[in-house]
């Protein structure tokens, strides 16, 4: 689900509104591109990215990509338009306020990606299953 509703285009710019119809400011995201990381085998990690950036376009959301191979671990933090694939994957969770990592199939490495739509939400990346809404027990709690 793509979070904001694009209402109209002015001068090739998208005017984006939130669920209440208020005009949405562009997102603030951590934006360090690719950096080496020490985040490994943890339920959640901080990005350790000191750069907070306004996204170029109002429809963009925050993205984090965690990759591990035989040589190193990296964490990528960027803004990205959820209508466009990133690393060949669709940003399925762009409406989420939290950056909940999901594993993607990439040969030769372990690859996790998350996206989210609250300010600086890609600063705290969450791997723990307890946050994953595909967990039926959590869904039960949510709908009770």
């Amino acid at each position: 689900t793509i979070p904001p509703h694009v209402q109209k285009s002015v001068n090739n710019d998208m005017i984006v509104t939130d669920n209440n119809g208020a005009v949405k400011f562009p997102q603030l995201c951590k934006f360090c591109d690719v950096r080496f990381s020490t985040c490994d085998n943890q339920k959640s990690c901080m990005s350790n990215c000191s750069i907070t950036s306004i996204c170029e376009k109002p429809q963009e959301v925050c993205v984090a990509v965690w990759r591990k191979n035989d040589e190193n671990i990296t964490l990528e933090t960027v803004c990205h338009d959820p209508k466009l694939p990133y690393h060949d994957f669709i940003l399925e969770d762009a409406a989420s306020p939290k950056c909940i990592m999901k594993e993607k199939k990439k040969p030769g490495e372990t690859f996790f990606m998350c996206s989210c739509s609250s300010d600086e939400c890609n600063d705290n990346i969450i791997f723990s299953e307890e946050y994953n809404t595909s967990n039926p027990d959590l869904l039960l709690v949510i709908f009770q």
Partner: nanobody, 111 residues
Framework: QVQLQESGGGLVQAGGSLRLSCAAS????????VAWYRQPPGKQREGVAH???????IYADSVKGRFTISRDNSKNTVYLEMNSLKPEDTAVYYC??????WGQGTQVTVS
């Protein structure tokens, strides 16, 4: 080296006006989205006004009709015209542009 430098803040009475400037060096603001944010004392940073590179402007509901964001590309500067100021507009005002550029801020106090 990229620098954004705000100026124009100060002490003003309620109902008064100020014009903030954000002068850039090391970056061409005409090709960038630029926004003004503010941080009121003891509160979170909040978006005030946004100007896209395509010319579209966005304003926070709290300042709509009172504040105007504009650009002078020849001076590589963005402005925030603030009219009918209220005490709740008291804050440090920052300009920002992608990717991750922020000014040091300018204090606006409305008495």
């Amino acid at each position: 080296q990229v620098q954004l430098q705000e100026s124009g803040g100060g002490l003003v009475q309620a109902g008064g006006s100020l014009r903030l400037s954000c002068a850039a060096s090391g970056i061409d603001l005409s090709t960038k989205s630029v926004a003004w944010y503010r941080q009121p004392p003891g509160k979170q940073r909040e978006g005030v006004a946004h100007s896209s590179s395509g010319g579209t402007t966005i304003y926070a509901d709290s300042v709509k009709g009172r504040f105007t964001i504009s650009r002078d590309n020849s001076k590589n500067t963005v402005y925030l015209e603030m009219n009918s100021l209220k005490p709740e507009d008291t804050a440090v005002y920052y300009c920002t542009a992608p990717v991750g550029y922020w000014g040091q801020g300018t204090q606006v106090t409305v008495s």
